[in-house]
């Protein structure tokens, strides 16, 4: 059994040159003829030199999975899916995303350090002492209120609540 060169494929005991991206094998090589290739039909593709008898079906971006079509399929490139706004890719295979998750909402006591993108979740960070956040999409923690001279501090602020002041 011969070992074929890179970008050749084995047919019986012969090595045939592969087809170009965007094509598939229509007729394998013989003594006097090279590999005859045919263009991929619509909605199919081959991204690399190949010995495939059929092109691969183009991926479909499922809106129920939070996906939208970012780049249409071509004969030599699969469909590129992206997550809809507010979602990020959970399962990425090369440039193909199969499932999306909603961006994390920062809990009370935390602020948004890095906004979520189509391929990254939101990054949250704790509020420093003396500041608080109600969570959500807040990017800055707010400083606790300083009760005025005419007010009494009823409850000290926490990382998720402001100081509570009361009038005397």
């Amino acid at each position: 059994q011969p070992s074929c060169r890179q970008e050749e494929f084995l047919v019986g005991d012969e090595c045939c040159p592969m087809c170009n991206p965007g094509y598939h094998v229509k007729q394998v090589c013989s003594e006097h003829t090279g590999t005859v290739c045919a263009p991929c039909p619509p909605q199919t593709y081959t991204a690399h030199a190949n010995g495939l008898s059929k092109c691969l079906p183009c991926g479909v971006c499922d809106p129920d999975m939070g996906l939208l079509t970012w780049q249409e399929c071509s004969s030599w490139k699969d469909t590129v899916c992206r997550c809809i706004p507010g979602y990020f890719c959970e399962n990425q295979d090369g440039s193909h995303c199969s499932t999306c998750l909603q961006h994390t909402t920062c809990p009370p006591g935390q602020r948004v350090e890095k906004r979520g993108t189509h391929d990254q979740d939101t990054v949250c960070a704790d509020c420093l002492t003396g500041t608080f956040s109600l969570g959500g999409t807040q990017e800055e923690c707010l400083p606790w209120t300083n009760c005025s001279a005419f007010q009494q501090e009823v409850r000290r602020g926490t990382n998720s609540t402001d100081t509570t002041c009361s009038s005397q």
Epitope: R5, Q6, E7, E8, C15, C16, P17, M18, C19, N20, Y23, K26, C29, H32, T33, G34, T35, V36, C37, A49
Partner: antibody
Framework: EVQLLESGGGLVQPGGSLRLSCAAS????????MSWVRQAPGKGLEWVSS???????YYNPSLESRFTISRDNSKNTLYLQMNSLRAEDTAVYYC?????????WGQGTLVTVSS | EIVLTQSPGTLSLSPGERATLSCRAS??????LAWYQQKPGQAPRLLIY???SRTTGIPDRFSGSGSGTDFTLTISRLEPEDFAVYYC??????????FGQGTKVEIK
């Protein structure tokens, strides 16, 4: 004697059309794949299209579906219909037998695309 | 597409000398490579197919070798009528069939 004779070339304006013919003699035309190869002035050879004996057709992807190859086995003739011609299509167009290596060539017909 | 690169671009030699022309493919084309000779104002003529098989009527001073990505056309002793442009062409994976840019063999 095995022979291929092209005709139909000439001067055409950009955007125009032209149909080239290639008359074959001296061999069983229907048994062979046939091809068109072109050569721009002072440049190298460029494959244009092939039609197999089965009737399957193949084109250079760079031509963007502007050309159509066909054959009439009863007339031993190969054709190339060229539409939406551009200045860069100016070349000598050769008809050749074969779809792999081209063993018989015609003398070529000059196509000039110019306004 | 498979790109064929021929070297040198021009070869200046005297009659009787040996000419060695190279053709390199961007990826393997197996043995499916042809060589053509073209003289000014004429159609190309097939010399070699299948990398090493001579076409009927081609003198044995022309020989081809190689497989995969590296190919050579050798003219053992140049005759005056051999000065011309030579093209390699792959048909290992088609379409598209592709040609090299050519090597001109000129008289020194």
């Amino acid at each position: 004697e095995v022979q291929l004779l092209e005709s139909g070339g000439g001067l055409v304006q950009p955007g125009g059309s032209l149909r080239l013919s290639c008359a074959a003699s001296g061999f069983t035309f229907s048994n062979y794949g046939m091809s068109w190869v072109r050569q721009a002035p002072g440049k190298g050879l460029e494959w244009v299209s092939s039609i197999y004996y089965s009737g399957d057709t193949y084109y250079n992807p760079s031509l963007e579906s502007r050309f159509t190859i066909s054959r009439d086995n009863s007339k031993n003739t190969l054709y190339l219909q060229m539409n939406s011609l551009r200045a860069e299509d100016t070349a000598v167009y050769y008809c050749a037998s074969g779809s792999n290596a081209f063993d018989i060539w015609g003398q070529g017909t000059l196509v000039t695309v110019s306004s | 597409e498979i790109v064929l690169t021929q070297s040198p671009g021009t070869l200046s030699l005297s009659p009787g000398e040996r000419a060695t022309l190279s053709c390199r493919a961007s990826r393997s084309v197996g043995k499916y490579l042809a060589w053509y000779q073209q003289k000014p104002g004429q159609a190309p003529r097939l010399l070699i197919y299948g990398a090493s098989s001579r076409t009927t009527g081609i003198p044995d001073r022309f020989s081809g070798s190689g497989s995969g990505t590296d190919f050579t056309l050798t003219i053992s002793r140049l005759e005056p009528e051999d000065f011309a442009v030579y093209y390699c062409q792959q048909y290992g994976s088609s379409p598209p069939v592709t040609f090299g840019q050519g090597t001109k063999v000129e008289i020194k």
